[in-house]
Interface confidence: low
């Protein structure tokens, strides 16, 4: 019968002919009376056989990622009679893996949006690298993920590529972060290959800033002839948040005379001081009122950022008009 062991050839071997193993008949007594032949795809071009001994060699560099096994046929003939000594037999040559492929991130570019001030542990995005090497061959395709850029704000789970928040971030300080993730095969051991990807993480706004008046004192004037409903000036607060988180409402906090009102222009986010009652220079020629400003929408969990509304003082001078 036929005698052989399992045949393996490492991929990417640079030797001009790499000995793989030996095929022989147990009837072969070593006196060179038998002839061995190799048939099938790759016979003669990729693999050759020593016709006298049955030793098989690879004569080309092989790439396991291109082709991982070859199915060949063997024959053995008695040279004297030309007859087959053994029935033709099929055998397999497996191409064994070496770590010659770096991990690749196939779904680039990565981009994620996460609310600012999200707590530690919040999931941001999962990145996944692929390694063309053999997952069943040692650690050649076993990947570990690590963070090259993004500390101390982000962390990556080493085995899953899940990116999480590791420290609170404030959009008003920085609204986007570039995180660089490395995937390393061989579970980080010597000889490991690596690939990197960039993840753009954008912070969405939460209402963690209250509006604050630009000035602590505004000076306005009103003519005593002004009718009620007259706009006598504007006041303005600023809010570091954006969008609806920066929408604000102005109101009167203190006006003993109940002469003025403030309405909010929701397009410009200005407060418009309105005359509610007519004024009389001869009766009172100046007024002092206090205004406050608050955000329009404040979720309950963000109320701690909105204690004590910002206030401002408005001094209003009444202008005299000649009366008949």
């Amino acid at each position: 019968g036929w005698v052989w062991n399992q045949f393996f050839v490492p991929e990417e071997m640079n030797t001009t002919s790499h000995h793989i193993g030996q095929l022989r008949s147990d009837l072969d007594n070593g006196n060179n009376s038998f002839q061995y032949k190799l048939l099938g795809a790759g016979a003669g071009s990729t693999f050759i056989i020593d016709e006298r001994t049955g030793d098989i060699y690879a004569i080309q560099k092989l790439d396991r990622e291109e082709r991982s096994l070859y199915i060949l046929r063997a024959q053995v003939i008695d040279i004297a009679t030309g007859r087959a000594v053994e029935p033709e037999s099929e055998f397999v040559i497996k191409v064994s893996d070496i770590n010659d492929n770096e991990p690749k991130f196939l779904d680039e570019p990565y981009e994620a949006i996460v609310p600012e001030m999200s707590p530690e542990g919040t999931l941001v995005i999962q990145v996944t690298a692929s390694d063309a090497d053999d997952p069943s061959s040692g650690n050649n395709a076993r990947l570990l993920y690590s963070l090259l850029q993004g500390q101390p704000y982000f962390s990556v789970e080493p085995t899953t590529g899940v990116i999480r928040i590791s420290s609170k971030m404030d959009r008003e300080l920085q609204d986007e972060y570039w995180v660089i993730i490395q995937a390393k095969d061989m579970i980080g051991q010597p000889g490991a290959l690596s690939g990197t990807t960039s993840v753009l993480i954008k912070l969405s706004d939460v209402n963690d800033n209250k509006p604050i008046f630009k000035e602590s004192l505004y000076r306005l004037t009103v003519s005593e002839s002004a009718p009620t409903g007259t706009s006598i000036g504007t006041i303005m607060a600023y809010d570091n948040d954006i969008g609806e988180n920066a929408e604000m409402d102005y109101s009167i906090e203190e006006d003993d005379s109940q002469t003025f009102d403030i309405i909010t222009n929701h397009e410009t986010q200005e407060g418009i001081v309105i005359l509610k009652k007519k004024v009389d220079f001869e009766h009172q020629n100046h007024y002092g009122i206090r205004a406050k400003v608050k955000n329009h929408h404040v979720p309950e969990q963000l109320m701690k950022y909105h204690t004590e509304a910002s206030t401002t003082f408005i001094k209003i001078q009444v202008e005299d008009v000649d009366e008949p």
Partner: antibody, heavy 120, light 111 residues
Framework: QVQLVQSGAEVKKPGASVKVSCKAS????????MSWVRQAPGQGLEWMGI????????TYAQKFQGRVTMTGDTSTSTVYMELSSLRSEDTAVYYC?????????????WGQGTLVTVSS | QSVLTQPPSASGTPGQRVTISCSGS????????VNWYQQLPGTAPKLLIY???QRPSGVPDRFSGSKSGTSASLAISGLQSEDEADYYC???????????FGGGTKLTVLS
Amino acid sequence: QVQLVQSGAEVKKPGASVKVSCKASRYTFTSYYMSWVRQAPGQGLEWMGIIHPSGGDTTYAQKFQGRVTMTGDTSTSTVYMELSSLRSEDTAVYYCARGGIKLWLHFDYWGQGTLVTVSS
Amino acid sequence: QSVLTQPPSASGTPGQRVTISCSGSRSNIGSNFVNWYQQLPGTAPKLLIYTNNQRPSGVPDRFSGSKSGTSASLAISGLQSEDEADYYCAVYDDSLNGWVFGGGTKLTVLS
């Protein structure tokens, strides 16, 4: 280089109040929180409270609620810490420390400290 | 009793590596930056490590910080006599809505 210069040492009787000042320079005063931290003789650091000079927002440690008042004067870039109903255990060095632009960011610069002695 | 727990003392000889731990909870170390301060005798505290592991300019790279879960640690390698000081960890606490300090660790450099 940021500078925080505190007022001089004080000796007070039990029951009195003390007001310590901290003058800031070489940075935008209204952008950063300011904390007050005290250290009793031979003891560790104890956070008292924090103020944002721009809006006057304050947060006080539970222990000092009702006894401490922190204020800021933007015209002179100075913050003040007033502690009332003093008792002997309030004898300590009081430090002002500049925080970040958020409540939860580190204190990067400290004043030289003001020794307050409470003794009858 | 401090919210953050530090060993009261630590020691080492010149050239040695010393580690100081700081243990807290989810509401402080678990969800905020850890900072370390060095206080030399008779002086104001000085920021040594901020945002868990960053060093301000002028702080030697012998000092390093790390954080894992609800604990943090300060490591000092190549210990020098001038490192003899008190070391405090500090962190913002979300539950208390305020800052908390560790009780402090007195580091002695043995000659």
